[in-house]
């Protein structure tokens, strides 16, 4: 464990800093200049620094479970858990699920009535008795309901020609009902005759494009529990179709832009506002179904199985069955799907704030274990065989009191989890002994909490009418700085710098703004190590023989000396045994300047006066040409030929000397003077 803390001045702040942090409440644990924050550290560190084990405050997260034995059949236990959460430290508890036998079932049959489902409708009309019989094999209390859908009644989903709206079927002789989005036909009932009668009245309909408005219909079935008649039992929604589905965004094709609002809009058992709202998104529908504990069974023809299998990956607790072309196998399909659904258990929770994190370890009866998952998941769950989930809840900060529920998807049982913060320190301070705080405050977890008008570690400083802001002001460098640079205590308007636990680090300065460690490093050591230099308030002071911002250079100039032992040829300065040349001159010794302008034109008047004592500088040659020295012998260097003041050509050679603008000049004896026209 580690404890990373920032500006901790109380036990609570320490506990909030992380699960590895503990607080020492021992009196006089801090020495002069020590910050209160040194009371906050890992348990081993505090023990090592002399804090007794019973002086260490280390509240831990814990879970208390309560069983609620009232009410009927319970598949989840416990029913209530109270968690006390310390930030960063998980509290864990077990949830047991025992699948009950004969749990009541509500089954709503939602059928596509587009024209291609004509033969299916014939078979479903005879289905009522078979469906209820099949349910009664599984449960003592089964109910069935019925609804149907086609699509939104605008182009391009249906043909809006008045004749086609009256009778959308391709066969004019066929009796056919106008298209509609969703019709709730039969409320959930245990009367199979009523199912037969109501479904028997249904007529086929038709639409234009291949996908249907099934998601619209499913959303209404989930959003209208009273109208559908859902009980608080296992809820199955059989969705029978031979085609795909429209989803959010498709409404734009029919100029329907308002997003689906996920609310109930049934009037006279019809979804009359379907042309006002777009289709729901798959995620939106999945959320609504889970919220209402509805488990969809997609009964679809063979060519659509793959499509709906993809849908079940997004919708939890859903299943797909292959429907024969005429729906004759639907009862068998529902039985299989129900067995599949009820043998898979997902444990999940409602939405939580970012400050709470929940993970699940699933210990399934077949020996399979899933750890640290965002939800519990066990497959092949058998009747009366308990399975266990370990739920771990972590708070990232000191949370407000709140609660959330955990449910097994598709089942009505819930576990209510109440969450409380575990951030207070129950310190055993010397009652209300004020003597340790100069009688001007009381002890709280080893620290003096001073009365108004007093401040300081032991309330030793009287503010004397000065506000604490004024006193603190003299402990700040400026208004934007923090008190004593955050590295000391402001005691009666003066900074008392903290002692550092970093070896070799001394904090000092009027505002504790300086230390002996925050300087540039060389070879991994501050100022190159104690042999090269020392750190003073952010700057290295190098020992004799060393230089550089981190004392990284030996003070030698050997690499800067030219053959005449002139540093950087007088055209630069030596830093760290390397020349820093003046503009244009090149390393290593600032000897050449290829980019510099030719000096020839600059020195013609000097050549003229030095050699011939003529020209504009004739009278004060040495003052005008201080950097030039006349040579009587030829020199090596730049050869020049320029016109003098009399229009004669003068040839001369400039040999650069050490320094800037210093040359040895050799001037040819003869000038070339061109005679003018006579």
């Amino acid at each position: 464990q580690e404890c990373t803390k920032f500006k901790v001045s109380s036990c609570r702040e320490c506990i909030e800093s992380g699960p590895g942090c503990t607080w020492c409440q021992k009196l006089n644990f801090t020495g002069p200049g020590d910050p209160d924050s040194i009371r906050c550290d890992t348990r081993p560190q505090l023990l090592m620094r002399g804090c007794a084990a019973d002086d260490i405050m280390d509240p831990t997260s814990l879970a208390e479970t309560q069983e609620d034995h009232n009410g009927g059949q319970k598949q989840l236990s416990p029913q209530k858990v109270t968690l006390y959460l310390r930030p960063g430290q998980a509290a864990a508890f077990n949830v047991t699920f025992r699948r009950a036998k004969g749990y009541p079932i509500d089954l709503y049959y939602l059928m596509d009535l587009s024209y291609s489902m004509l033969d299916d409708l014939r078979n479903v009309k005879k289905l009522g008795g078979d469906l209820l019989r099949a349910l009664n094999e599984i449960t003592e209390s089964g109910r069935i309901g019925f609804g149907s859908f086609v699509d939104k009644t605008v182009l391009p989903f249906v043909n809006t020609h008045p004749d086609k709206l009256r009778n959308p079927c391709p066969n004019k002789e066929k009796e056919c009902q106008p298209p509609f989005a969703f019709r709730h036909v039969l409320k959930l009932t245990n009367n199979s005759n009523q199912f037969q009668t109501e479904v028997g009245k249904q007529l086929i309909s038709g639409n234009l494009d291949a996908p249907e408005g099934g998601l619209d219909a499913m959303m209404q079935v989930a959003a209208c529990p009273e109208e559908i008649g859902w009980r608080n039992v296992t809820r199955l929604l059989v969705f029978a179709t031979d085609d795909g589905f429209h989803f959010a965004g498709d409404g734009k094709l029919g100029a329907i832009l308002t997003p689906n609002d996920g609310r109930c809009h049934l009037e006279d058992n019809l979804y009359k506002r379907s042309n006002e709202f777009d289709y729901p998104s798959v995620g939106q529908l999945a959320h609504k179904l889970a919220e209402n504990n509805i488990q969809p069974i997609f009964a679809v023809t063979s060519r659509m199985v793959k499509t709906y299998e993809k849908l079940t990956e997004i919708i939890p607790k859903s299943a797909v069955g292959e429907l024969s072309e005429d729906s004759s196998n639907v009862v068998h399909l529902i039985k299989n799907a129900y067995n599949k659904l009820s043998s898979r258990v997902f444990l999940d929770h409602n939405a939580l704030p970012d400050t709470l994190k929940v993970t699940y370890d699933s210990f399934c009866s077949n020996g399979v274990t899933h750890r640290n998952q965002p939800r519990g998941d066990c497959d092949g769950v058998q009747i009366n065989v308990p399975i266990t989930f370990q739920v771990k809840v972590t708070a990232t900060e000191c949370i407000q009191e709140q609660s959330f529920v955990i449910r097994a998807l598709g089942f009505t049982d819930i576990v209510t989890v109440q969450v409380l913060p575990q951030c207070e320190c129950r310190c055993r301070d010397q009652s209300r002994d004020r003597s340790l705080c100069h009688g001007k405050g009381f002890l709280e977890c080893g620290i003096c909490r001073c009365d108004t008008g007093y401040i300081g570690k032991n309330c030793e400083c009287q503010t004397q009418g000065r506000s604490s802001q004024e006193l603190e002001g003299s402990c700040r460098k400026d208004n934007n700085s923090i008190i004593c640079s955050g590295l000391g205590d402001c005691v009666c308007g003066q900074c008392l710098c903290h002692t550092s636990d970093v070896p070799g680090k001394l904090i000092y300065g009027q505002y504790c703004e300086c230390d002996t460690i925050n300087c540039e490093r060389y070879n991994g050591q501050v100022c190159g190590g104690p042999g090269r230099g020392l750190c003073f308030c952010g700057k290295c002071r190098c020992h004799p023989g060393f230089e550089g911002s981190a004392c990284q250079c030996e003070r030698t100039t050997e690499g800067c000396l030219n053959p005449r032992r002139v540093e950087c040829s007088g055209r630069g300065r030596c830093r760290c045994n390397v020349c820093e040349c003046h503009s244009g001159y090149q390393l290593p010794l600032c000897q050449e300047c290829p980019g510099c302008p030719s000096p020839c034109g600059k020195y013609i008047s000097c050549a003229e006066c030095l050699k011939f004592e003529k020209g504009p500088f004739g009278k004060n040659c040495s003052a005008a040409c201080p950097g030039l020295q006349l040579s009587n012998n030829p020199v090596k260097g730049r050869t020049c030929k320029e016109r003098d003041s009399e229009g004669c050509w003068v040839a001369y050679t400039l040999e650069q000397q050490d320094g800037m603008d210093r040359y040895l000049i050799y001037v040819d004896e003869s000038r070339e003077c061109v005679a003018g026209p006579n």
């Epitope: 690499g559 390397v578 020349c579 090149q586 390393l587 290593p588 010794l589 000897q591 050449e592 290829p594």
Partner: nanobody, 117 residues
Framework: EVQLVESGGGLVQAGGSLRLSCATS????????MAWYRQAPGKQRELVAT??????TDYSDSAKGRFTISRDNKNTVHLQMNSLKPEDTAVYYC????????????WGQGTQVTVSS
């Protein structure tokens, strides 16, 4: 990295001549200046002569007029030493520089020149 190998040293009578050579290998394309240094026993190392890629040469006062530095290609530099004196006795080292960093780190093993009187 550039390697420098000096050769041509030996024992010579005062007034005699020697021609030292320094061959470079490695990444030599960036070298701009080559130089000869020498170190006599118990003395500091001193720069004798330099030559740049442009042909600019520079000599110490003691070498001027007696020694000539030349470069026959980018890779080899020579020091022609005439009128040798006993005080020229030293280990002679070759050194190279780049425009970007100045003198390159490291030295060759040097070549011993001994001038007897």
């Amino acid at each position: 990295e550039v390697q420098l190998v000096e050769s041509g040293g030996g024992l010579v009578q005062a007034g005699g001549s020697l021609r030292l050579s320094c061959a470079t290998s490695g990444s030599v394309s960036s070298i701009n200046v080559m130089a000869w240094y020498r170190q006599a026993p118990g003395k500091q190392r001193e720069l004798v002569a330099t030559i740049s890629t442009s042909g600019y040469t520079d000599y110490s006062d003691s070498a001027k007029g007696r020694f000539t530095i030349s470069r026959d290609n980018k890779n080899t530099v020579h020091l022609q030493m005439n009128s040798l004196k006993p005080e020229d006795t030293a280990v002679y080292y070759c050194r190279a520089s780049t425009l970007r960093t100045g003198w390159l780190m490291g030295w060759g093993q040097g070549t011993q020149v001994t001038v007897s009187s």
